[in-house]
Interface confidence: low
Amino acid sequence: EDLKKVFPPKVAVFEPSEAEISHTQKATLVCLATGFYPDHVELSWWVNGKEVHSGVSTDPQPLKEQPALEDSRYSLSSRLRVSATFWHNPRNHFRCQVQFYGLSEDDEWTEDRDKPITQKISAEAWGRADC
Amino acid sequence: PYIQNPDPAVYQLRGSKSNDTSVCLFTDFDSVMNVSQSKDSDVHITDKTVLDMRSMDFKSNGAVAWSNKSDFACTSAFKDSVIPADTFFPSPESSC
């Protein structure tokens, strides 16, 4: 195995289904962090610049994307559920942030060697005004 | 946890930026229901997890399936789990 083989995650937020909103009056956003190796990441949700914990559920551990492969890359998913009215308020801003700590031997994810920087990767969505 | 009023549903979600991944959300199902892993290596399914909306005193089970396959559909995403046929909500071609 190449010890320098470290892959950061790709992060994407998926917007709630209008079907869910009309059926339940709730809205679930899904965050996917995919394609990372090794398997240690930390995922958090931020609403209007503040980290939130209520309404959040994250996989307890990452999933191997190719279980048969010894050095498979990993994925992690998380859900954030809010009320339909909260989602439909266009002023509300939702962000999924994934911190990835596996650093290759030449520190390629660190911009400034003097500071304890971790790589932060995020994806975001804005609330949608009613159609 | 005890889910008071299970209302199992599968919804298709749309990415906020253009990507090839399709995501299906299976939610609001009873705690006795198990979610099976996919036999298709290109389809990824998470274990069920519990979400607690504390401000609304509401808990729900959920699992997510996703794939980059062009023919991936939510109706078949959880085909290895026992899900009632009326669980699937079609996704409109375009909202708004």
Partner: nanobody
């Protein structure tokens, strides 16, 4: 800064067993990944086994079925139980830890395992 100290190496006959230990000190709560690696004379360093904070384990093909990685959080120690040792397992065995803070990646000094009759 995290420090890793390996122990448990030695000389063993083919078919024998050894248990390597890696004790982590300082900032251990910031570690979320451990690995055992080895380097045989004249060869590149290679992965033997990994264990993550969720106790997910991963083994090199050569270690599967013979070696077991485990950790004791209360002792800040990671173990590598090696059974059915072969001459080709002779190498310097290193412990590795990945941390959440700079400088992220830590290695021990290594412990020598020699399998010989």
């Amino acid at each position: 800064e995290v420090q890793l100290v390996e122990s448990g190496g030695g000389v063993v006959q083919p078919g024998g067993s050894l248990r390597l230990s890696c004790v982590a000190s300082y900032d251990v709560h910031k570690i979320n990944f451990y690995g055992w690696y080895r380097q045989a004379p004249g060869k590149e360093r290679e992965k033997v086994a990994h264990i993550s904070i969720g106790d997910q384990t991963d083994y090199a093909d050569s270690a599967k079925g013979r070696f077991t990685i485990s950790r004791d959080e209360s002792k800040n120690t990671v173990y590598l139980q090696m059974n059915s040792l072969r001459p080709e397992d002779t190498a310097l065995y290193y412990c590795r830890a990945l941390s959440k803070i700079w400088p992220y990646d830590y290695w021990g000094q290594g412990t020598l395992v020699t399998v010989s009759s």
